[in-house]
Interface confidence: medium
Amino acid sequence: MNGSEYFVKIQSFLGGAPTEDLKALSQQNVSMDLATFMKLRTDAVLPLTVAEVQKLLGPHVEGLKAEERHRPVRDWILRQRQDDLDTLGLGLQGGIPNGYLVLDLSMQEALSGTPCLLGP
Protein backbone atom coordinates (compact mmCIF):
# COMPACT_ATOMS: atom_id res chain seq x y z
CA MET A 1 0.00 0.00 0.00
CA ASN A 2 1.50 3.36 -1.00
CA GLY A 3 1.37 6.57 1.04
CA SER A 4 -1.67 7.99 -0.73
CA GLU A 5 -3.71 4.82 -0.27
CA TYR A 6 -2.70 4.60 3.40
CA PHE A 7 -3.75 8.22 3.91
CA VAL A 8 -7.22 7.54 2.46
CA LYS A 9 -7.71 4.74 4.99
CA ILE A 10 -6.77 6.85 8.02
CA GLN A 11 -8.11 10.21 6.80
CA SER A 12 -11.30 10.11 8.86
CA PHE A 13 -9.34 9.54 12.10
CA LEU A 14 -6.86 12.37 11.62
CA GLY A 15 -8.82 15.22 13.21
CA GLY A 16 -7.48 14.40 16.65
CA ALA A 17 -4.03 13.23 15.60
CA PRO A 18 -1.15 14.32 17.86
CA THR A 19 1.99 16.04 16.57
CA GLU A 20 4.02 12.81 16.70
CA ASP A 21 1.62 11.11 14.28
CA LEU A 22 1.69 14.08 11.92
CA LYS A 23 5.49 14.08 11.96
CA ALA A 24 5.47 10.36 11.18
CA LEU A 25 2.97 10.89 8.35
CA SER A 26 5.17 13.58 6.84
CA GLN A 27 7.77 10.90 6.19
CA GLN A 28 5.34 8.65 4.32
CA ASN A 29 4.58 10.56 1.12
CA VAL A 30 0.89 10.90 1.96
CA SER A 31 -0.02 14.23 0.23
CA MET A 32 -2.58 15.35 2.83
CA ASP A 33 -5.19 17.57 1.20
CA LEU A 34 -5.81 21.05 2.63
CA ALA A 35 -9.37 20.29 3.75
CA THR A 36 -7.99 17.61 6.06
CA PHE A 37 -5.06 19.77 7.17
CA MET A 38 -7.42 22.60 8.13
CA LYS A 39 -9.34 20.23 10.42
CA LEU A 40 -6.28 19.18 12.41
CA ARG A 41 -5.89 20.29 16.01
CA THR A 42 -4.06 23.61 16.11
CA ASP A 43 -1.88 22.45 19.01
CA ALA A 44 -0.82 19.42 16.94
CA VAL A 45 0.09 21.52 13.90
CA LEU A 46 2.02 24.28 15.68
CA PRO A 47 5.20 22.26 16.45
CA LEU A 48 5.58 21.06 12.84
CA THR A 49 8.51 22.53 10.96
CA VAL A 50 8.21 24.10 7.53
CA ALA A 51 9.95 21.08 6.02
CA GLU A 52 7.55 18.68 7.74
CA VAL A 53 4.48 20.57 6.54
CA GLN A 54 5.86 20.65 3.02
CA LYS A 55 6.39 16.88 3.08
CA LEU A 56 3.01 16.27 4.71
CA LEU A 57 1.06 18.27 2.12
CA GLY A 58 2.98 17.35 -1.04
CA PRO A 59 1.41 19.24 -3.96
CA HIS A 60 -1.13 20.82 -1.60
CA VAL A 61 1.55 22.94 0.06
CA GLU A 62 0.93 25.41 -2.77
CA GLY A 63 -2.54 26.00 -1.35
CA LEU A 64 -1.27 27.32 1.99
CA LYS A 65 -1.29 30.84 0.56
CA ALA A 66 -5.07 30.66 0.21
CA GLU A 67 -5.43 29.63 3.84
CA GLU A 68 -2.87 31.92 5.48
CA ARG A 69 -5.53 33.90 7.36
CA HIS A 70 -7.32 30.82 8.71
CA ARG A 71 -6.54 28.50 11.60
CA PRO A 72 -4.49 26.41 11.99
CA VAL A 73 -2.37 27.84 9.15
CA ARG A 74 -2.43 31.37 10.55
CA ASP A 75 -1.24 30.24 13.98
CA TRP A 76 1.35 27.91 12.47
CA ILE A 77 2.77 30.78 10.38
CA LEU A 78 3.19 32.90 13.52
CA ARG A 79 5.38 30.16 15.00
CA GLN A 80 7.74 29.82 12.04
CA ARG A 81 10.83 31.83 11.25
CA GLN A 82 10.16 34.11 8.30
CA ASP A 83 13.35 32.80 6.68
CA ASP A 84 11.92 29.27 6.77
CA LEU A 85 8.53 30.38 5.45
CA ASP A 86 10.28 32.15 2.57
CA THR A 87 11.76 28.84 1.45
CA LEU A 88 8.24 27.66 0.54
CA GLY A 89 8.07 30.19 -2.26
CA LEU A 90 4.46 31.09 -1.48
CA GLY A 91 4.81 34.63 -0.20
CA LEU A 92 3.56 33.69 3.28
CA GLN A 93 3.98 36.59 5.72
CA GLY A 94 3.77 36.91 9.50
CA GLY A 95 6.61 34.67 10.60
CA ILE A 96 9.14 35.46 13.30
CA PRO A 97 11.55 38.12 12.01
CA ASN A 98 15.15 37.14 11.41
CA GLY A 99 17.39 37.64 14.44
CA TYR A 100 14.66 37.16 17.04
CA LEU A 101 14.83 34.50 19.73
CA VAL A 102 11.74 32.42 20.44
CA LEU A 103 11.20 31.66 24.09
CA ASP A 104 9.02 28.63 24.74
CA LEU A 105 7.06 30.13 27.60
CA SER A 106 3.98 27.93 27.60
CA MET A 107 2.00 30.02 30.08
CA GLN A 108 2.76 33.26 28.27
CA GLU A 109 1.67 31.67 25.01
CA ALA A 110 -1.46 30.18 26.51
CA LEU A 111 -2.52 33.60 27.72
CA SER A 112 -1.61 35.65 24.67
CA GLY A 113 -1.95 33.07 21.89
CA THR A 114 1.43 34.09 20.47
CA PRO A 115 5.00 33.07 21.21
CA CYS A 116 7.18 35.37 23.31
CA LEU A 117 9.89 37.03 21.22
CA LEU A 118 13.11 38.69 22.26
CA GLY A 119 14.46 41.24 19.84
CA PRO A 120 18.01 41.19 18.51
Partner: antibody, heavy 120, light 107 residues
Framework: EVQLVQSGAEVKKPGASVKVSCKAS????????MHWVRQAPGQGLEWMGN????????NYNEKFKNRVTITVDKSASTAYMELSSLRSEDTAVYYC?????????????WGQGTLVTVSS | DIVMTQTPLSLSVTPGQPASISCKAS??????IAWYQQKPGQSPQALIY???YRYSGVPDRFSGSGSGTDFTLKISRVEAEDVGVYYC?????????FGGGTKVEIK
Protein backbone atom coordinates in the same frame (compact mmCIF):
# COMPACT_ATOMS: atom_id res chain seq x y z
CA GLU B 1 -2.91 40.78 -15.90
CA VAL B 2 -0.98 37.52 -15.63
CA GLN B 3 1.22 36.88 -18.66
CA LEU B 4 3.59 34.03 -19.44
CA VAL B 5 5.78 34.56 -22.48
CA GLN B 6 7.82 31.60 -23.68
CA SER B 7 10.85 31.45 -25.93
CA GLY B 8 10.54 30.60 -29.61
CA ALA B 9 10.41 27.28 -31.45
CA GLU B 10 13.52 25.12 -31.51
CA VAL B 11 14.81 22.40 -33.82
CA LYS B 12 17.31 20.03 -32.27
CA LYS B 13 19.19 16.90 -33.24
CA PRO B 14 18.84 13.65 -31.27
CA GLY B 15 21.19 13.62 -28.28
CA ALA B 16 21.26 17.39 -27.97
CA SER B 17 19.74 19.53 -25.20
CA VAL B 18 17.15 22.29 -25.29
CA LYS B 19 16.44 25.08 -22.81
CA VAL B 20 13.03 26.74 -22.92
CA SER B 21 12.34 29.97 -21.03
CA CYS B 22 9.13 31.36 -19.57
CA LYS B 23 8.98 35.02 -18.50
CA ALA B 24 6.21 35.78 -16.02
CA SER B 25 4.55 39.12 -15.32
CA UNK B 26 1.40 40.44 -13.68
CA UNK B 27 1.86 38.59 -10.39
CA UNK B 28 4.47 38.06 -7.67
CA UNK B 29 6.78 35.55 -9.33
CA UNK B 30 8.24 34.21 -6.08
CA UNK B 31 4.82 33.47 -4.57
CA UNK B 32 3.71 30.71 -6.93
CA UNK B 33 5.45 27.58 -8.09
CA MET B 34 5.99 27.18 -11.82
CA HIS B 35 5.13 23.91 -13.54
CA TRP B 36 6.03 22.54 -16.96
CA VAL B 37 3.69 20.41 -19.04
CA ARG B 38 4.32 19.01 -22.50
CA GLN B 39 2.13 17.81 -25.34
CA ALA B 40 3.35 15.66 -28.20
CA PRO B 41 1.64 16.23 -31.58
CA GLY B 42 -1.94 14.91 -31.44
CA GLN B 43 -1.37 13.58 -27.92
CA GLY B 44 -2.45 14.46 -24.40
CA LEU B 45 -0.87 16.57 -21.67
CA GLU B 46 2.03 15.30 -19.58
CA TRP B 47 3.32 16.93 -16.38
CA MET B 48 7.11 17.19 -16.27
CA GLY B 49 7.81 18.89 -12.98
CA ASN B 50 7.75 22.13 -11.05
CA UNK B 51 10.04 24.60 -9.34
CA UNK B 52 9.76 26.65 -6.17
CA UNK B 53 10.84 30.10 -7.42
CA UNK B 54 11.96 31.18 -3.97
CA UNK B 55 14.72 28.65 -3.46
CA UNK B 56 14.90 26.67 -6.71
CA UNK B 57 13.64 23.46 -5.10
CA UNK B 58 11.95 21.19 -7.61
CA ASN B 59 9.81 18.10 -8.08
CA TYR B 60 10.12 16.00 -11.21
CA ASN B 61 8.10 13.34 -12.94
CA GLU B 62 10.21 10.16 -12.57
CA LYS B 63 9.85 9.61 -16.31
CA PHE B 64 12.06 12.67 -16.92
CA LYS B 65 14.03 12.77 -13.69
CA ASN B 66 17.48 12.19 -15.12
CA ARG B 67 16.97 14.36 -18.19
CA VAL B 68 15.02 17.43 -17.08
CA THR B 69 16.21 20.40 -15.03
CA ILE B 70 13.85 23.19 -14.04
CA THR B 71 15.41 26.41 -12.76
CA VAL B 72 14.50 30.03 -12.14
CA ASP B 73 16.06 33.47 -12.37
CA LYS B 74 14.20 35.43 -9.71
CA SER B 75 15.60 38.76 -10.80
CA ALA B 76 14.22 38.23 -14.30
CA SER B 77 10.97 36.55 -13.16
CA THR B 78 11.83 33.76 -15.56
CA ALA B 79 11.62 29.99 -15.29
CA TYR B 80 13.60 27.59 -17.45
CA MET B 81 13.12 23.98 -18.45
CA GLU B 82 16.14 22.15 -19.86
CA LEU B 83 15.72 18.70 -21.39
CA SER B 84 18.82 16.72 -22.32
CA SER B 85 19.57 13.61 -24.40
CA LEU B 86 16.75 14.51 -26.75
CA ARG B 87 15.05 11.82 -28.82
CA SER B 88 12.38 12.00 -31.49
CA GLU B 89 9.65 11.23 -28.92
CA ASP B 90 10.50 14.53 -27.21
CA THR B 91 9.06 16.43 -30.16
CA ALA B 92 6.28 18.34 -28.44
CA VAL B 93 4.89 21.69 -27.39
CA TYR B 94 6.22 22.62 -23.96
CA TYR B 95 4.10 24.81 -21.68
CA CYS B 96 4.85 26.65 -18.47
CA UNK B 97 2.00 27.23 -16.03
CA UNK B 98 1.91 28.49 -12.43
CA UNK B 99 -0.31 26.62 -10.00
CA UNK B 100 -2.79 27.97 -7.43
CA UNK B 101 -2.81 31.58 -8.62
CA UNK B 102 -5.71 33.48 -7.06
CA UNK B 103 -6.10 30.85 -4.34
CA UNK B 104 -7.57 28.33 -6.76
CA UNK B 105 -5.81 25.06 -7.50
CA UNK B 106 -5.15 24.04 -11.07
CA UNK B 107 -3.48 25.74 -14.00
CA UNK B 108 -5.51 28.88 -14.62
CA UNK B 109 -2.77 30.48 -16.73
CA TRP B 110 -0.59 28.94 -19.43
CA GLY B 111 2.28 30.15 -21.58
CA GLN B 112 1.68 30.19 -25.34
CA GLY B 113 3.77 27.04 -25.71
CA THR B 114 7.15 26.35 -27.30
CA LEU B 115 7.41 23.78 -30.06
CA VAL B 116 10.55 21.68 -29.80
CA THR B 117 11.22 19.49 -32.83
CA VAL B 118 13.80 16.72 -32.53
CA SER B 119 14.93 15.51 -35.92
CA SER B 120 18.12 14.25 -37.50
CA ASP C 1 1.39 7.11 -10.40
CA ILE C 2 -2.33 7.88 -10.42
CA VAL C 3 -3.81 6.95 -13.79
CA MET C 4 -6.69 9.11 -15.05
CA THR C 5 -8.94 7.32 -17.55
CA GLN C 6 -11.31 9.42 -19.62
CA THR C 7 -14.34 8.18 -21.57
CA PRO C 8 -15.48 8.49 -24.23
CA LEU C 9 -12.52 9.16 -26.49
CA SER C 10 -14.65 11.36 -28.71
CA LEU C 11 -18.13 12.80 -28.67
CA SER C 12 -20.26 14.20 -31.49
CA VAL C 13 -23.03 16.43 -30.18
CA THR C 14 -25.90 18.36 -31.74
CA PRO C 15 -25.87 22.05 -30.73
CA GLY C 16 -28.19 22.66 -27.80
CA GLN C 17 -27.90 19.07 -26.59
CA PRO C 18 -26.08 18.00 -23.40
CA ALA C 19 -22.71 16.26 -23.27
CA SER C 20 -21.06 14.31 -20.49
CA ILE C 21 -17.43 13.25 -20.04
CA SER C 22 -16.30 10.74 -17.44
CA CYS C 23 -12.93 10.61 -15.69
CA LYS C 24 -11.88 7.76 -13.41
CA ALA C 25 -8.86 7.89 -11.12
CA SER C 26 -6.93 4.72 -10.32
CA UNK C 27 -7.00 5.67 -6.64
CA UNK C 28 -8.86 8.05 -4.36
CA UNK C 29 -8.01 11.69 -5.13
CA UNK C 30 -10.71 13.32 -2.99
CA UNK C 31 -11.95 16.32 -4.98
CA UNK C 32 -8.48 17.31 -6.17
CA ILE C 33 -9.44 17.39 -9.81
CA ALA C 34 -9.39 20.09 -12.47
CA TRP C 35 -10.90 20.12 -15.98
CA TYR C 36 -9.44 21.88 -19.02
CA GLN C 37 -10.62 22.69 -22.52
CA GLN C 38 -8.13 22.90 -25.37
CA LYS C 39 -9.18 24.38 -28.67
CA PRO C 40 -7.17 23.54 -31.81
CA GLY C 41 -3.84 25.36 -31.88
CA GLN C 42 -4.32 26.94 -28.46
CA SER C 43 -3.03 26.44 -24.94
CA PRO C 44 -5.39 24.64 -22.54
CA GLN C 45 -7.94 26.71 -20.65
CA ALA C 46 -9.03 25.94 -17.10
CA LEU C 47 -12.74 25.26 -16.61
CA ILE C 48 -13.23 23.57 -13.24
CA TYR C 49 -11.19 23.18 -10.06
CA UNK C 50 -11.78 21.13 -6.90
CA UNK C 51 -14.03 18.85 -8.99
CA UNK C 52 -17.03 21.19 -9.07
CA TYR C 53 -16.03 24.87 -8.93
CA ARG C 54 -16.02 26.95 -12.09
CA TYR C 55 -13.19 29.36 -12.76
CA SER C 56 -14.33 32.95 -13.21
CA GLY C 57 -15.47 33.64 -16.75
CA VAL C 58 -16.43 30.03 -17.46
CA PRO C 59 -20.03 29.79 -18.73
CA ASP C 60 -22.46 28.14 -16.31
CA ARG C 61 -23.37 25.51 -18.87
CA PHE C 62 -20.17 23.77 -17.73
CA SER C 63 -20.40 21.85 -14.46
CA GLY C 64 -18.26 19.30 -12.68
CA SER C 65 -19.13 16.68 -10.11
CA GLY C 66 -17.73 13.67 -8.31
CA SER C 67 -15.28 12.73 -5.58
CA GLY C 68 -12.98 9.87 -4.74
CA THR C 69 -12.34 8.09 -8.04
CA ASP C 70 -15.30 9.00 -10.30
CA PHE C 71 -15.71 12.43 -11.86
CA THR C 72 -17.92 13.95 -14.54
CA LEU C 73 -17.80 17.10 -16.64
CA LYS C 74 -21.17 18.09 -18.08
CA ILE C 75 -22.05 20.65 -20.72
CA SER C 76 -25.76 21.33 -20.35
CA ARG C 77 -26.27 22.76 -23.86
CA VAL C 78 -23.37 22.37 -26.26
CA GLU C 79 -22.51 25.39 -28.40
CA ALA C 80 -20.37 25.54 -31.53
CA GLU C 81 -17.56 27.24 -29.60
CA ASP C 82 -17.29 24.25 -27.24
CA VAL C 83 -15.45 22.13 -29.81
CA GLY C 84 -12.06 20.98 -28.63
CA VAL C 85 -10.40 18.41 -26.43
CA TYR C 86 -11.27 18.20 -22.74
CA TYR C 87 -8.84 16.92 -20.12
CA CYS C 88 -9.20 16.02 -16.46
CA UNK C 89 -6.19 16.37 -14.16
CA UNK C 90 -5.48 15.26 -10.61
CA UNK C 91 -3.35 17.38 -8.30
CA UNK C 92 -3.74 15.11 -5.30
CA UNK C 93 -0.21 13.73 -5.41
CA UNK C 94 2.98 13.84 -7.44
CA UNK C 95 3.37 13.26 -10.27
CA UNK C 96 0.39 15.36 -11.36
CA UNK C 97 -1.39 13.41 -14.09
CA PHE C 98 -3.88 14.12 -16.86
CA GLY C 99 -6.54 12.04 -18.53
CA GLY C 100 -6.00 11.09 -22.15
CA GLY C 101 -8.54 13.64 -23.39
CA THR C 102 -12.01 13.60 -24.92
CA LYS C 103 -12.57 15.24 -28.29
CA VAL C 104 -15.90 17.08 -28.57
CA GLU C 105 -17.21 17.74 -32.07
CA ILE C 106 -20.38 19.35 -33.35
CA LYS C 107 -22.77 17.31 -35.50
Amino acid sequence: EVQLVQSGAEVKKPGASVKVSCKASGYTFTSYWMHWVRQAPGQGLEWMGNVNPSNGGSNYNEKFKNRVTITVDKSASTAYMELSSLRSEDTAVYYCAPHYIGSRPGFAYWGQGTLVTVSS
Amino acid sequence: DIVMTQTPLSLSVTPGQPASISCKASQNVGTNIAWYQQKPGQSPQALIYSASYRYSGVPDRFSGSGSGTDFTLKISRVEAEDVGVYYCQQYNSYPLTFGGGTKVEIK
